[in-house]
């Protein structure tokens, strides 16, 4: 997450390029949904606080078989620091909520959004 | 806080021309996209033109591309609209929206200015 | 294009439960933002992303969205709230886009 460190300076703060990317990808993956996303498959919810993106990874891995979230695991797996593998959980999973890979996406999309909202604020 | 000031309207025959400014204060200009949005008498909003924080991206609505153009001045904390070739049903009020950040995506007004009537007519 | 549609008016009485739809296709796919507009004056943005409220907005106005419907809910409707409302989203072909417009009476 240090990407988001210069978000504080003034003047013009382009996103960097990572996350606009990623979130771009959301954009795409939210807005191109002519069937239920991934078969309606269903992921762990997340806290979306920090360590987010690994905790993020770790529940989108364990959908198989999903081209629409593929380019996503991996810009994902840029942003986290250890390596990820299918059946890894964190603290951070809500564990006892399993929701539909379309909203955990939008949810993804809406948080890192207001993320950058709130950082060129400040 | 935030304000957007609109000026530039008045009549003008169909064929003729005028520019819009919109004078931005109380935020950081150059971290918003800013759009112009009119209202036809007795009528609905309708989305014109939005330019990116940074100039990089202007886009415009199919009724008015080819004859309007969107510029702005982050030194000056301004937007404008030339407007060519204006037809009747031009004629609205033409409204300066804040974006709600700096993405694409976050285009959507938050806050307007309080607008400035075109009128196209002979 | 991308295209909204909101019913030409709701009537509600005061107190009352008010609710405006706006449908389009995979709205609940976008994120969506409701306006509202009284005579003479610039529209005020009430909800942004679905359902969050600006500050200075009153708790009475919330918002969903899901599938292709949005919803505009105000409960315990105030005769203040007359006015008229648009639903707003982005889209990534039509970039902004409005629907119709919603004419709210409180009776």
């Known amino acids: 997450l240090t990407c988001l460190g210069g978000f504080a300076s003034p003047g013009p703060v382009p996103p960097s390029t990572a996350l606009r990317e990623l979130i771009e990808e959301l954009v795409n993956i939210t807005q191109n949904q002519k069937a239920p996303l991934c078969n309606g498959s269903m992921v762990w919810s997340i806290n979306l606080t920090a360590g987010m993106y690994c905790a993020a990874l770790e529940s989108l891995i364990n959908v198989s078989g999903c081209s629409a979230i593929e380019k996503t695991q991996r810009m994902l797996s840029g942003f986290c620091p250890h390596k990820v593998s299918a059946g890894q959980f964190s603290s951070l999973h809500v564990r006892d909520t399993k929701i539909e890979v379309a909203q955990f996406v939008k949810d993804l999309l809406l948080h890192l959004k207001k993320l950058f909202r709130e950082g060129q604020f400040n | 806080q935030v304000q957007l000031v609109e000026s530039g309207g008045g009549l003008v025959q169909p064929g003729g021309s005028l520019r819009l400014s919109c004078a931005a204060s109380?935020?950081?200009?150059?971290?918003?996209?800013i759009n112009w949005v009119r209202q036809a008498p007795g009528k609905g909003l309708e989305w014109v033109s939005g330019?990116?924080?940074?100039?990089?991206?202007?886009l415009y609505a199919d009724s008015v591309k080819g004859r309007f153009t969107i510029s702005r001045d982050n030194s000056k904390n301004t937007l404008y609209l030339q407007m060519n070739s204006l037809r009747a049903e031009d004629t609205a009020v033409y409204y300066c929206?804040?974006?709600?950040?700096?993405?694409?995506?976050?285009?959507?007004?938050?806050?307007w200015g309080q607008g400035t009537l075109v009128t196209v007519s002979s | 294009s991308y295209e909204l549609t909101q019913p030409p008016s709701v009537s509600v009485a005061p107190g009352q439960t008010a609710r405006i739809s706006c449908s389009g296709d995979?709205?609940?796919?976008?994120?969506v933002s409701w306006y509202q507009q009284k005579p003479g004056q610039a529209p005020v943005l009430v909800i942004y992303?679905?359902?969050d409220r600006p500050s200075g907005i009153p708790e009475r106005f919330s918002g969903s969205n899901s599938g292709n419907t949005a919803t505009l809910t105000i409960s315990g409707t105030q005769a203040e709230d007359e006015a008229d409302y648009y639903c707003g989203t982005w889209d990534m072909v039509t970039n902004n886009v409005f629907g119709g417009g919603t004419k709210l009476t409180v009776l």
């Open positions: 992303d679905d359902n």
């Open positions: 109380g935020f950081t200009f150059n971290s918003y996209w």
């Open positions: 929206a804040r974006g709600l950040g700096a993405f694409h995506a976050d285009m959507q007004p938050d806050y």
């Open positions: 330019i990116a924080y940074d100039s990089s991206n202007t």
């Open positions: 995979n709205i609940g796919g976008t994120f």
